[in-house]
């Protein structure tokens, strides 16, 4: 197949991505004597970067886009893992379109799973956004979660907290959150496994089995939450803690109620 | 570098089996590819048809999946097209490819007739 | 499923340059390969990855990608430049490659 010539060497960063069609014409316009305003690096196309887990078959290619400006013009790098990313890190290296903000991995095999991170910055900031990449077999494979979801969480007493699991599953997955319990005091039953109580399950009733709301939270609802995602191949899961706080003394009402929580527990299996 | 050839029956007749096999030399299926099939109707586009891993894994055009086999023979080096119930709308040159993101190279293409 | 959109014709004069273009939703995510097909024989890989070049093919193929559309530029052009030419992405979304639907290249004169 070609080998391109690794890495290449695109143009510089244009200020005015290519690939954003906003209008850019509310930003002032230099005049012949003036500088031009410093401006720190900012995205110019968000809404092209919320995917940030690409679970991806072996032997594909796979493009990560960071669109950006600033001025002057920014820098692009990429971080694998939080180090630096050399084209000799993998094989047949990987391609940086400066023009377009964008890196390009040809081929990828498994090796190649982790998190990318785009910085972009000029003397004014910096700012930077990761992907994850997942290289799978072709489906059906095991349930894929994105990763930092979901995430923990510290709120006040009676609000409301949302978590997150981002799921990549084929064949259909199914999707329960559980929170793990003390029965009798002890947080693990008889037979070695933590005690648990399903608070949700993709199935009916369930709108939207990826995002668990808890509303007007107790400090009884403290503690680890565990998003599990589990087909017919294999399982996934991934926890979060939610930290329930009081407010300061002279906030407090008068007397506290505390609602009646009723635990219905099985054993995690 | 690597060559690819189909070989199978140029004639297939209405509501049987359409088989082809494509045979790798100059490189091993076992490489970090997809081995592709794409057809192409007389006076008319490319179509992906589908794929396969040397581990077995495939994937298939939607409008064909229900009728669509591709297998591997590594010990052979070769993989095969089965293509179900055919019609006369079936009637095209049929190519394999390597495939990582793209096609490169392709066999040079056979014509499969249906007709009885 | 993933649309891939060209014109079905394109003519140039020899010398002139040819832009073929390739419409799909938010293509320049994706990486955008084409391919020239003469009668009578199988498709050749002339631009991949956007804008990159397989050995053999001649600098006057070149690529871009951004946006909602991909452009194959063939600069200077020959009557030997004179066939069908495709447009192809594997969509990421799906797990499915998608062809265009092929642009028909006529050298004039």
């Known amino acids: 197949r070609p080998s391109p010539t690794l890495p290449e060497q695109d143009a510089l960063p244009s200020s005015e991505d290519d690939d954003d069609d906003d209008d850019s014409s509310s930003e002032e316009k230099e005049t012949d004597n003036t500088k031009p305003n410093p401006v720190a690096p900012y995205w110019t196309s968000p809404e092209k970067m919320e995917k940030k887990l690409h679970a991806v078959p072996a032997a594909k290619t796979v493009k990560f886009k960071c669109p950006s400006s600033g001025t002057p013009n920014p820098t692009l790098r990429w971080l694998k893992n939080g180090k630096e990313f050399k084209p000799d890190h993998r094989i047949g290296g990987y391609k940086v379109r400066y023009a377009t903000w964008s890196i390009i991995m040809d081929s990828v095999v498994p090796s190649d799973k982790g998190n990318y991170t785009c910085i972009v910055e000029n003397e004014y900031g910096s700012i930077n956004h990761t992907y994850q990449l997942d290289v799978v077999e072709r489906s059906p494979h095991r349930p894929i979660l994105q990763a930092g979801l979901p995430a923990n969480k510290t709120v006040a007493l009676g609000s409301n907290v949302e978590f997150m699991c981002k799921v990549y599953s084929d064949p259909q997955p199914h999707i329960q959150w559980l929170k793990h319990i003390e029965v009798n005091g002890s947080k693990i039953g008889p037979d070695n496994l933590p005690y648990v109580q399903i608070l949700k399950h993709s199935g009916i009733n369930s709108s939207d089995a990826e995002v668990l709301t808890l509303f007007n939270v107790t400090e009884a609802q403290s503690g680890e939450y565990v998003c599990k995602v589990s087909n017919y191949i294999g399982e996934a899961n991934q926890s979060a803690w939610l930290t329930v706080t009081r407010p300061a003394l002279e906030e407090r009402p008068a007397v506290m109620t505390s609602p009646l929580y009723l635990e219905h527990h099985h054993h995690h299996h | 570098q690597v060559q690819l050839q189909e070989s199978g029956p140029g004639l297939v007749k209405p509501s049987g089996t359409l088989s082809l096999t494509c045979a790798v030399s100059?490189?091993?299926?076992?490489?970090?590819?997809?081995w592709s099939w794409v057809r192409q109707p007389p006076g008319k586009g490319l179509e992906w048809i589908g794929e396969i891993y040397h581990s077995g894994s495939t994937s298939y055009n939607p409008s064909l999946k229900s009728r669509v086999t591709i297998s591997v023979d590594k010990s052979k080096n070769q993989f095969s097209l089965k293509l179900s119930s055919v019609t006369a709308a079936d009637t095209a040159v049929y190519y394999c490819?390597?495939?990582?993101?793209?096609?490169?190279?392709w066999g040079q293409g056979t014509l499969v007739t249906v007709s009885s | 499923s993933y649309v891939l959109t060209q014109p079905p014709s394109v003519s140039v004069a020899p010398g002139q340059t040819a832009r073929i273009t390739c419409g799909g939703n938010n293509i320049g995510s994706e990486s955008v390969h084409w391919y020239q097909q003469k009668p009578g024989q199988a498709p050749v890989l002339v631009v991949y990855d956007d804008s990159d070049r397989p050995s053999g093919i001649p600098e006057r193929f070149s690529g871009s990608n951004s946006g909602n559309t991909a452009t194959l530029t063939i600069s200077r052009v020959e009557a030997g430049d004179e066939a069908d030419y495709y447009c192809q992405v594997w969509d990421s979304t799906s797990d499915h490659r998608v062809f265009g639907g092929g642009t028909k290249l006529t050298v004039l004169g």
């Open positions: 100059g490189g091993s299926i076992s490489s970090n590819n997809w």
């Open positions: 490819a390597r495939a990582t993101d793209w096609y490169d190279p």
